[in-house]
Interface confidence: low
């Protein structure tokens, strides 16, 4: 029977530790059923619409680059973007829109309107999230687009503002 | 030892392709452990409190009839619904309710007030989502009730309105 | 090889049920592969801004005690919790905050601002939530802060405030 | 379990002030509205007005230039003063916490005016 | 301000009977309704608050249902201790006003 000697290719994991051929439970417990996720928080500083993330966060089987989480194994995933929005009202209302993209498409958006009454207050805090369920193929992308980014408020709450992926079902 | 001419009934899936009876990392890969989860867009025409939904969404181990989604594998599930409101303020606030179901009981709402300041916006862009964990059986149903549907956004947005569902753990 | 009558500890869960060594199928349906989840609703009288939950809820492989969810296996875990507000409004307008906090350091936290016109409605309905994914080590413990909590709105929507945590990979 | 309780002389002459206090007791003042509502003989109830903690009040339009509420967070009690009063202001006076509708009570003061 | 009227302002019911009290609002109130149960020389008891929830402690036969402006009070099954004063109130807007009130009397 298939040893820990099985050579290290994507598909074929070596079963870690130990030589445990013979142990089924053993054999089970380690067993490659391959998960991915990532859970990155946004940059400190936006200039655009798309949003950039901070690369120093969670990522195992996903890659990150230029504002993309970029899949890595193929399957139904599960995506997630919270943020926090900081308003200065203006005299009218403000919409704030999320936008979560696929490929640069547009999946799915979440909008709220605030500053509803005007001047009647300072500042107004939001919070806006969105989810995904979808099927991702290899080298799929996933971003996100805020038109408000300006209002996105990185300084009090750094940690507020999250993009994160996981793998529900992989598509062996 | 078993082969892949298990014979193909719920709980004896036949391990796909090839025969690698030999072979356990082969077997562990093709392993049916049992997911099911479905994700459903609000049909674009809604005319009660009971949200109707796009039934050629996602669907896998799920059945949806007449509004609910019906589960066929029992376990503990993450159920989530998430909807975009459109209100057009009349002069007095307005409070957005969303009922997850199980079986027809209400097991969890949300509820906001929009239009607070009465008439100083046209509209006001509402996003509202609910969660539930909770364990289900074969044939439970899980839908969804808002008051008022007629403000929920399926023009602008016919993408942003959903039901879903995954099985978490299974009570094999 | 390995058998039912594997010691029962934590790491050598018996395979349930009948003897089944030699049918690889059967073995892999019972595989001890860990899950832990919670979900618990919010205690009816709440007096201090720590929240306490009632421990009738659902609880497997995590633990309750003075406020915490007490984690018992490593892993990485997905935390959420989802709180409704009922707010008289007074003359300003008030800020609603939910922190989670990991081992007493707030990891995460959403705000969201109310009664921004005023006396114009008596009572404001808010539904906030916050997630996180995160590692978790053995006896972490997880709890959430609410500084304005008196308006956690626990006699009419007692089910609608939880906190819920489900481990996504364990770090075997 | 909350309690309330009004204090408060029982008989004010026509045109002086009508002095309550209430005392909460078993749970803080903090985060709720509080209520004076009033009953006069043989008939039904009215709302005075309300404070929050923060001190922010609001009262009955057809009592609003007589009414005072305050409150004292550090002793856990809100008072009423109701100034220029006349027989038609004898009343049984209730306070009460406003969390939705009054959940709480006090056992009520009568307070009579005459002279 | 928003006029608070209950119907009957007197009932007669024994023992056993089911009785419903109807409070009617000058307008819309959403559900910001609630009931207190009254007796002779003691402050008002909240039963019933936002239209049909039952506060704590108060015993089942007690119901509350209605939308909007129109509202009802039900006893299932009147006990010895149910004969009192009964009230509605609305604090949907300022300032908050009660209903005149219903004497329920043993028949």
């Known amino acids: 029977q298939r040893t820990d000697s099985i050579p290290n290719s994507p598909d074929n994991i070596p079963l870690r530790g130990g030589n445990c051929s013979e142990d089924l439970l053993c054999i089970l417990k380690r067993a490659p059923f391959k998960k991915s996720w990532a859970y990155l928080q946004v940059a400190k500083h936006l200039n655009k619409t798309k949003l950039s993330w901070n690369k120093d966060g969670i990522l195992h089987g996903v890659r990150y680059q230029d504002g993309n989480l970029v899949i890595q194994f193929p399957g139904l995933y599960f995506i997630i973007c919270q943020l926090q929005f900081l308003v200065q009202c203006p005299n009218n209302s403000v919409d704030l829109k999320l936008e979560l993209l696929i490929n640069k498409h547009i999946k799915k958006q979440a909008l709220v309107t605030v500053c509803e009454s005007g001047m009647q207050t300072k500042h107004v805090y939001q919070n806006l999230s969105q989810f995904l369920l979808d099927y991702l193929q290899v080298n799929t992308t996933v971003s996100v687009n805020v038109d408000t980014f300006q209002y996105i408020d990185t300084s009090t709450f750094p940690l507020e503002n999250v993009l994160s992926v996981f793998l529900y079902s992989n598509s062996d | 030892q078993r082969t892949d001419s298990i014979p193909n009934s719920p709980d004896n899936i036949p391990l796909r392709g090839g025969n690698c009876s030999e072979d356990l990392l082969c077997i562990l890969k093709r392993a049916p452990f049992k997911k099911s989860w479905a994700y459903l867009q609000v049909a674009k025409h809604l005319n009660k409190t009971k949200l109707s939904w796009n039934k050629d969404g996602i669907l896998h181990g799920v059945r949806y009839q007449d509004g609910n989604l019906v589960i066929q594998f029992p376990g503990l599930y993450f159920i989530i619904c998430q909807l975009q409101f459109l209100v057009q303020c009349p002069n007095n606030s307005v409070d957005l309710k969303l009922e997850l179901l199980i079986n027809k009981h209400i097991k969890k709402q949300a509820l906001v007030t929009v239009c607070e300041s009465g008439m100083q916006t046209k509209h006001v862009y509402q996003n509202l989502s609910q969660f539930l964990l909770d364990y289900l059986q074969v044939n439970t149903t899980v839908s969804v009730n808002v008051d008022t549907f007629q403000y929920i956004d399926t023009s602008t947005f016919p993408l942003e309105n959903v039901l879903s569902v995954f099985l978490y753990s299974n009570s094999d | 090889q390995r058998t039912d009558s594997i010691p029962n500890s934590p790491d050598n869960i018996p395979l349930r049920g009948g003897n089944c060594s030699e049918d690889l199928l059967c073995i892999l349906k019972r595989a001890p592969f860990k899950k832990s989840w919670a979900y618990l609703q919010v205690a009816k009288h709440l007096n201090k801004t720590k929240l306490s939950w009632n421990k009738d809820g659902i609880l497997h492989g995590v633990r309750y005690q003075d406020g915490n969810l007490v984690i018992q296996f490593p892993g990485l875990y997905f935390i959420i919790c989802q709180l409704q507000f009922l707010v008289q409004c007074p003359n300003n307008s008030v800020d609603l905050k939910l922190e989670l906090l990991i081992n007493k350091h707030i990891k995460k936290q959403a705000l969201v601002t109310v009664c921004e016109s005023g006396m114009q409605t008596k009572h404001v309905y808010q539904n906030l939530s916050q997630f996180l994914l995160d590692y978790l080590q053995v006896n972490t413990t997880v709890s959430v802060n609410v500084d304005t909590f008196q308006y956690i709105d626990t006699s009419t929507f007692p089910l609608e405030n939880v906190l819920s945590v489900f481990l996504y990979s364990n770090s075997d | 379990q909350v309690q309330l309780q009004e204090s408060g002389p029982g008989l004010v002459k026509p045109s002086e002030t009508l002095s309550l206090t209430c005392t909460v007791s078993g749970g803080s003042i903090s985060g709720y509205y509080w209520s004076w509502i009033r009953q006069p003989p043989v008939k039904g109830l009215e709302w005075i007005g309300y404070i929050f903690y923060s001190g922010y009040t609001k009262y009955n339009p057809s009592l609003k230039s007589r009414v005072t509420i305050s409150v004292d967070t550090s002793k856990n009690q809100f008072s009423l003063k109701l100034s220029s009063v006349t027989a038609a202001d004898t009343a049984v006076y209730y306070c009460a916490r406003d969390r939705w509708d009054f959940d709480y009570w006090g056992q009520g003061a009568l307070v009579t005016v005459s002279s | 301000a928003i006029q608070m009227t209950q119907s009957p302002s007197y009932l007669s019911a024994s023992v056993g009977d089911r009785v419903t009290i109807a409070c009617r609002a000058s307008?819309?109130?959403?559900?910001?309704l609630g009931w207190y149960q009254q007796k002779p020389g003691k402050a008002p008891k909240l039963l019933i608050y936002?239209?049909?929830s039952l506060q704590s402690g108060v015993p089942s036969r007690f119901s509350g249902s209605g939308s909007g402006t129109d509202f009802t009070l039900t006893i299932s099954s009147l006990q010895p201790e149910d004969f009192a004063t009964y009230y509605c109130?609305?604090?949907?807007?300022?300032?908050?006003?009660f209903g005149q009130g219903t004497k329920l009397e043993i028949k």
């Open positions: 307008q819309g109130i959403r559900n910001n």
């Open positions: 109130l609305q604090d949907f807007n300022y300032p908050y006003t």
């Open positions: 936002a239209e049909s």
